[in-house]
């Protein structure tokens, strides 16, 4: 679940298993020049930066709950 | 590599408190964590909470609460718990479990500390 | 709170043969489970998490299945060291649950 920071990919492999109770926040990446695939990065808890599957359901589910609570609040 | 080293066994008296301590080594404490799990003698796990190190945050199984209670200190990466009013109920073997930061199973446990209420 | 019921509660099978055990919860905990093993004087040792994901270090012997409320682990080929109790854990919602545990024994 390393994450680069070149501009490039940031993401060379996801994690599984992701659990949002230590997610602090989520960062979508769209496709751009710098990566042709959707990125999504999660700042846990402790300060740590992870790699998502974007085509996960629960990875899915994770980013819709974060965006509704930016939302409401 | 990661290591939980739990205190050693305690033999206390109805009514009265113990404290157990979980020394962590090998990751950075703050940054994750810490579960407590009670099993009873012949019994099976149960959850009764967890600290945070890196803010003190707390989640209690409502079970526990006010039985319970748990600090950590980061000078010393050793977390505790208090347990009060004790009670034979409360004889049991308590173990410390390390949370993983991304995914929560609990990846790490201590050996365990028995605690026997007797008079 | 999630109730996890856990069945068997013991169940005695052959070296070399296979084992299944189920937990049922009481609502859809989105594949947020895990096994352990425990034995006797030890820490209990995380064996499968996420329903599925094999822990480092863990025998591909063991396996897990399932979805919604329910939810399977297995071990074929079995070994002299795989007597042990075996707990699941929901982690879906606090407060965490286990099932009650299988007590795992040989023939």
């Known amino acids: 679940a390393s994450v680069a920071t070149e501009l490039r990919c940031q993401c060379l492999q996801t994690l599984q298993g992701i659990h949002p109770k230590n997610i602090q926040s989520v960062n979508v990446k769209s496709p751009g020049p710098h990566c042709a695939q959707t990125e999504v990065i999660a700042t846990l808890k402790n300060g740590r930066k992870a790699c998502l599957n974007p085509a996960s359901p629960i990875v899915k589910k994770i980013i819709e709950k974060m965006l509704n609570s930016d939302k409401s609040n | 590599q990661v290591q939980l080293q739990q205190s050693g066994a305690e033999l206390v008296r109805p009514g009265s408190s113990v404290k157990i301590s979980c020394k962590a080594s090998?990751?950075?404490?703050?940054?994750?964590?810490m579960n407590w799990v009670k099993q009873r003698p012949g019994q099976g796990l149960e959850w009764i909470g967890q600290?945070?190190?890196?803010?003190?945050?707390?989640n209690y199984n409502g079970k526990f609460k006010g039985k319970g209670t748990l600090t950590a200190d980061k000078s010393s990466s050793t977390a505790y718990m208090q347990l009060n009013s004790l009670t034979s109920e409360d004889s049991a073997v308590y173990f410390c479990a390390r949370e993983r930061d991304y995914d929560v199973a609990m990846d790490y446990w201590g050996q365990g500390t028995s605690v026997t209420v007797s008079s | 709170d999630i109730q996890m019921t856990q069945s068997p509660s013991s169940l005695s099978a052959s070296l070399g043969g296979k084992v299944t055990i189920t937990c049922k919860a009481s609502q859809d905990i989105n594949k947020y489970i895990a096994w352990f093993q425990h034995k006797p004087g030890k820490g209990p040792r995380l064996v499968i998490h996420?329903?599925?994901i094999l822990q480092p270090g863990i025998p591909s012997r063991f396996s897990g299945v399932g979805s919604g409320r329910d939810y399977s682990f297995s071990i074929r080929n079995l070994e002299p060291e795989d007597i042990a109790t075996y707990y699941c854990?929901?982690?879906?919602?606090?407060?965490?649950?286990f099932g009650g545990g299988t007590k795992l024994e040989i023939k």
């Open positions: 854990l929901q982690y879906d919602n606090l407060p965490w649950t």
């Open positions: 996420y329903t599925s």
């Open positions: 090998g990751y950075a404490f703050s940054d994750y964590w």
């Open positions: 600290i945070y190190p890196g803010d003190a945050d707390t």
